[in-house]
Amino acid sequence: ASNKTTLQKMGKKQNGKSKKVEEAEPEEFVVEKVLDRRVVNGKVEYFLKWKGFTDADNTWEPEENLDCPELIEAFLNSQKAGKEKDGTKRKSLSDSESDDSKSKKKRDAADKPRGFARGLDPERIIGATDSSGELMFLMKWKDSDEADLVLAKEANMKCPQIVIAFYEERLTWHSCPEDEAQ
């Protein structure tokens, strides 16, 4: 198998341009890695890293549209191995983790989808910051204890009602000089 996936059905965006479904020869993109799996309305979807694209272009795609069985199998095996490892007794482990496990954790964290890429429904904004130079919201997701920092402009588009609710709750109409940064 070639790991090529025909994205005719989804109309996947490439460099911001939506692929047209009616194209005679739909463009094929190459899957580099399968990063995550979820079930939505009873259908299995995989979170994919695309060859030649950055992590920002990672997408969730339905299993039925994919033609990369080896990559899916590799992902499922890695999940299984991880579970088996977690299930074993840890008596032999010293207090300090090995460098290998630390770097694996770092890799896993880097591979983990963040923000809206997690495919979860936003529940509420629990804070905001512009410390990185761009306004970010700390977003709490439904059915998850993990919150992520997401770009405010992305939230404005993807969940305007959540953003409005946040501003309504947090808006104060009086201005206290002591509450303003220099």
Epitope: A128, T129, S131, A147, T172, D179
Partner: antibody, heavy 121, light 112 residues
Framework: AVQLVQSGAEVKKPGESLRISCKGS????????ISWVRQMPGKGLEWMGR????????NYSPSFQGHVTISADKSISTAYLQWSSLKTSDTAMYYC??????????????WGQGTLVTVSS | ASALTQPASVSGSPGQSITISCTGT?????????VSWYQQHPGKAPKLMIY???KRPSGVSNRFSGSKSGNTASLTISGLQAEDEADYYC???????????FGGGTKLTVLG
Amino acid sequence: AVQLVQSGAEVKKPGESLRISCKGSGYSFTSYWISWVRQMPGKGLEWMGRIDPSDSYTNYSPSFQGHVTISADKSISTAYLQWSSLKTSDTAMYYCARPLQTYSIASVGHWGQGTLVTVSS
Amino acid sequence: ASALTQPASVSGSPGQSITISCTGTSSDVGSYNLVSWYQQHPGKAPKLMIYEGSKRPSGVSNRFSGSKSGNTASLTISGLQAEDEADYYCCSYAGSSTFAVFGGGTKLTVLG
């Protein structure tokens, strides 16, 4: 002016329950999270958790989750920290605090005067 | 998450500059520009000196400044004054499960 006024010092026995309070004034109480911070005698600050008084949504530090309960009554602009069964190791000064801005994530700019809790048999 | 690492004590003479470091991990200090610094005099409540890495609340002297490099945040106090003698704590957002974590504190002594 923004004020956070905490309830007075408490002396309790191990196993007893306790609720201490923090009353906010001089600002819109429901627009700002209230955090609780512990300082054991001669030790540093420890972040315990926070509550959004508008709907009582909470975040707890894993170290304190299950040991304390943070609540709020927005009708009287008051946040609470409570224990169902105190231990001697709960002896500490407890501060409530409020962010500088309504949306601040992990910094607090206004502090209560602190409530000293002593647990001793 | 375990506490952020700060030196136990730092000292300097009036007029000098001192820097207090606060070392975390890639899960807290390194991941977010959300470090705050607090000053605490004996028997008093803490006072916010710096937030979001380098922002100063109004009323705080511009002798206090904050910065960050990698997993380490720093508080610099220039033109040291006697009243700066206090304990200083750093604090960082540490992800949604831990939320916030403080450093162990640094005792600043102003000599002479």
